[in-house]
Amino acid sequence: ELSPQPSNEVNLLDSKTIQGELGWISYPSHGWEEISGVDEHYTPIRTYQVCNVMDHSQNNWLRTNWVPRNSAQKIYVELKFTLRDCNSIPLVLGTCKETFNLYYMESDDHGVKFREHQFTKIDTIAADESFTQMDLGDRILKLNTEIREVGPVNKKGFYLAFQDVGACVALVSVRVYFKKCPFTVKNLAMFPDTVPMDSQSLVEVRGSCVNNSKEEDPPRMYCSTEGEWLVPIGKCTCNAGYEERGFICQACRPGFYKASDGAAKCAKCPPHSSTQEDGSMNCRCENNYFRAEKDPPSMACARPPSAPRNVISNINETSVILDWSWPLDTGGRKDITFNIICKKCGWNVRQCEPCSPNVRFLPRQLGLTNTTVTVTDLLAHTNYTFEIDAVNGVSELSSPPRQYAAVSITTNQAAPSPVMTIKKDRTSRNSISLSWQEPEHPNGIILDYEVKYYQKQEQETSYTILRARGTNVTISSLKPDTTYVFQIRARTAAGYGTNSRKFEFETSPDSFSISGENSHV
């Protein structure tokens, strides 16, 4: 399989990529010979070979064309070659060698004539595995790769030369390269191609943040002589509206947002909000939905609550207790409170005015968190309308109408106190006559009394109510010889008082009558 060249290597010469003849200088002319061959992948290439193994004192030179240095300070020479085992060649004992020599010469000029003595030896090259005649069937195993480094190089370019001293060798490819720290992105910072120094020191390189990001700490890295980036320091982070994807900051897609700079990912828009464009820092609320000023962008958009329900008023003289149920729709928020608007009205409900400041609300008029309020210090015999507003954190952002429930009441004096004693005047088999005294505190004109009775053994599962104008009553159609329980309460314009305690009386067993008994429970 073809192994790609590392990205940190920059070729100055690669014989495999040259189309046609290489045209290098061979001296003497019957030494190195340019031939067509194949590489380890059976790709046709131009190679140089020499196999003058019969003669002693071979000195065959092959010089490359001039190679420009570019920005390299240290260069690497990669040789791929095949070297034939001397034992596989008949007749040549003593004259055959299994090494060759690598030289170089720096030059600012590329028209230099070839002179051996101007070249500096880099190394003697020997095969890691030379191959014998029996190896020739499988070409891939015959290839040797040797790499040598040269440097520092200072002039504009250089020549390489190969000296054969009697080996049977083919140069399959010659690659000359230098190492650079390649363009890279680390921690969202871009670091440019950087050529390292020849010395052992590292080159410090300042990174620049990728698009749509900003420095968190100044990004830096060090370029080593081997063309490797080392010790990343600092970083960039994506701006609001952008998230890290691979090596870039990518805009949040429609429907997603990112509120602040940093490493967080784009988040889905919260309920009842959306974005139509890329790169959103927050999501816009849908129509009739709102976000309060101090709400974070991650909070769902909400709407005002619906009106409170099931308002009940309990009037006591010039006070009223108002109770209600929570709105069916909270609007999507938990911060619901209730405000009470108090209006004093004439006998025509449409003619109302705000209540006097003397009216008191317990625990308070505005910002109630529970569903009950007591209103006191109202005027007696007066019509009032109470509007109970349900509000939440976004109510003030929405246009009217308000969401409220209203209740109208009329104040009065207090209801009468209880009847204290009930007296049995007489009884028969089917009837009982009762009388009582007016309550101690009638609190007005008593309009009538409510008499409630039931058979004791039935435990109030079934009872009868009748009204009496005065302070006595005869109850008929009763069962003989039966105990009945009686309660009485008075009614005024203010309403019913509380019931008396329970009194028990019995009907007669026979047809005679009994009179003048009190009863105690």
Epitope: H30, M54, Q133, A170
Partner: antibody, heavy 121, light 106 residues
Amino acid sequence: QVQLLQSGAEVKKPGASVKVPCKASGYTFTSRAMSWVRQAPGQGLEWMGWINTNTGNPTYAQGFTGRFVFSLDTSVSTAYLQISSLKAEDTAVYYCARVRFTVYGDGMDVWGQGTLVTVSS
Amino acid sequence: EIVLTQSPATLSVSPGERATLSCRASQSVSSNLPWYQQKPGQAPRLLIYGASTRPTGIPDRFSASGSGTDFTLTISRVEPEDFAVYYCQQYGPSWTFGQGTKVEIK
């Protein structure tokens, strides 16, 4: 231009000897081995052996020992094949051929034009 | 001694056709196997060495392959000047030639 030049045809009597020269030009004579090949009329090629032109050391193939001798005169870049006690079955064209060793394999890359030796009484 | 057997002995082809010649060794000779071409009245000429490498000047219609004991010489499109006898040769301890394959005009 690399070439091997051989002498013209020879006619010999049985029992006689013949020395066939092969003069090399256009390259360093001692840098390549020299091979000898025989081809009887209407037959295929037969490798006779070779000589190391650097050391003068010969190698003979089976069937070509005894009466066949390879020799050199490096001063005139010439290789010789001498056959003694000629027999009728020695009648053939004799080729000298330069041996080429390469990394990928060997072969005889330059041939003389051949010398026809006829043995007839 | 290694014996090389070439087949067929004679191959009749028309110009422009493909010709495939076979050479089989009695034991493995790896890839050190050259091929030669010999025209009537001429010395042989080296066509291929190392089983598949062409010397300078040999047309690329000649190609060869194989290793071990089985080798093939292929002429992709036979030209008039290609009618000749073709020999394979092995380089063992002692060198030997095959008996040759004659390529003639059909």
